[in-house]
């Protein structure tokens, strides 16, 4: 096995910081898994740099990542998902930095979707529901969800609720009347698999009813 790089390139390379982070997504495209890595320093010159993963693979000892702009990724069914893999940044055959990672501990779920809020007049509450593709998955099925909501005018005043189901009830009396609210949700692995928060779902906007003066309740 051989590869090469100019000596000058290697000397320059050793001056740089090649720290990187990765996340995995299991069954992200049918039965295919993905692994995405990127340098923590956005200014790293990636021209001759490649990522390689070795170990805990089926069929092959090592795989090369595909480069797309500033990210490197692999989409394959061939992750064993048992034991640690060695992920290296390489110039030719020279490894600049490596990390031993168990892909089951860096899982980033897919973002929840179909978030909606329905007001129940009789119950004086709001039923928040959303969907997740993980209900259909074989591996990462159990998630913790983080529902965040705020009054639209309160830019950074988010209220967070953690839940394991895909349904949440918000009591009307806990919300301001006649106000516009923004709500969104994200997920994180919660059983066996470990990792990171998903991206946020698209936000959903809803308005609370006005207070009915005679009863002191919202319309």
């Amino acid at each position: 096995e051989s590869g090469y790089a100019q000596n000058g390139d290697l000397e320059d390379a050793e001056l740089d910081d090649y720290s990187f982070s990765c996340y995995s997504q299991l069954e992200v495209n049918g039965s295919q898994h993905s692994l995405t890595c990127a340098f923590e320093d956005p200014d790293v010159n990636t021209t001759n740099l490649e990522f390689e993963i070795c170990g805990a693979l089926v069929e092959v000892k090592c795989l090369n990542f595909r480069k797309l702009q500033e990210i490197y990724f692999i989409e394959t069914k061939k992750f064993l998902l048992i034991g640690k893999s060695n992920i290296c940044v390489k110039v030719g055959e020279k490894s600049l930095t490596c990390k031993k990672i168990d892909l089951t501990t860096i899982v980033k779920p897919e973002a929840p979707f179909d978030l909606s809020v329905i007001y129940r007049e009789g119950a004086n509450d709001f039923v928040v529901t959303f969907n997740t593709s993980h209900l259909q998955k074989k591996y990462v099925k159990v998630l913790m969800h983080d529902v965040a909501y705020r009054q639209e005018k309160d830019e950074n005043k988010w209220t967070h609720v953690n839940l394991s189901s895909t349904k949440l009830t918000l009591l009307q009396r806990k919300l301001q009347p006649a106000a516009m609210y923004e709500i969104k949700v994200r997920s994180i692995p919660d059983h066996y698999f470990k990792g990171f928060w998903s991206e946020w779902s698209p936000s959903y906007y809803f308005r609370t009813p006005e207070i009915n003066n005679s009863s002191g309740e919202m319309d």
């Epitope: 096995e1 069929e59 090369n64 390489k90």
Partner: antibody, heavy 122, light 107 residues
């Protein structure tokens, strides 16, 4: 449709050099690892070299390491094999081959050229 | 380096026969094995990869199996067009390696 066409084979004396080319069409060359595989007359298949999709990594068996160099020009849709210090045992039909899977490095080959004969003899 | 031992080197069979070719590797290749068919004067054709996945367009009479170091190509009912030479190949690690080949001849 996918096509691989080798050229550059011929008769060369021991110690001589030859450059093989493989012109490809019908797919995006830059998406694929590519390989050269040879077959001596009446013998089995022998892997000669592989180059990664980016061209940054090259692989050789000990039998040709230091004598053969694989390269690619994605813009010209071409793969090359520069063969130096040729020996009688390098006599073979040389095939260029494309893996079934794009990217990553799964090296099983679904498309092969027709082959070009290299004869090393004095 | 991974060594490949393919057997038999040749066999004689009749149309309709069940034919089995084996390939043994010197170390576990985790199903990183392919099978090819080659006819005289032609380039090899991919039959099977991932030890047991039939390549598109390959007749279902061909099948691959095995794991660890032992792999098998089976032709369930030999047809006239199947008389050829068959090679296994490991792609688990570099250097890539082929078996010595099995020539299937008409009895």
């Amino acid at each position: 449709q996918v096509q691989l066409v080798e050229s550059g084979g011929g008769l060369v004396k021991p110690g001589g050099s030859l450059r093989l080319s493989c012109a490809v069409s019908g797919f995006t060359l830059s998406d694929y690892y590519m390989a050269w595989i040879r077959q001596a007359p009446g013998k089995g298949l022998e892997w000669v070299s592989t180059i990664s999709a980016s061209g940054l990594r090259t692989y050789y068996p000990d039998s040709v390491k230091g004598r053969f160099t694989i390269s690619r020009d994605n813009a010209k849709n071409s793969l090359y094999l520069q063969m130096n210090s040729l020996r009688a045992e390098d006599t073979a039909v040389y095939y260029c081959a494309r893996p079934l899977s794009a990217h990553y490095g799964f090296n099983y080959f679904d498309y092969w050229g027709q082959g070009t004969l290299v004869t090393v003899s004095s | 380096d991974i060594q490949m031992t393919q057997s038999p080197s040749s066999l004689s069979a009749s149309v309709g026969d069940r034919v089995t070719i084996t390939c043994r590797t010197s170390e576990d290749i985790y199903q990183g094995l392919a099978w090819y068919q080659q006819k005289p004067g032609k380039a090899p054709k991919l039959l099977v990869y991932s030890a047991n996945t039939l390549h598109i367009g390959v007749p279902s009479r061909f099948s691959g199996s095995g794991s660890g170091t032992d792999y098998t190509l089976t032709i369930s009912s030999l047809q006239p067009e199947d008389f050829a030479t068959y090679f296994c190949q490991q792609y688990y690690d570099y250097p890539l390696a082929f078996g010595g080949g099995t020539k299937v001849e008409i009895k």
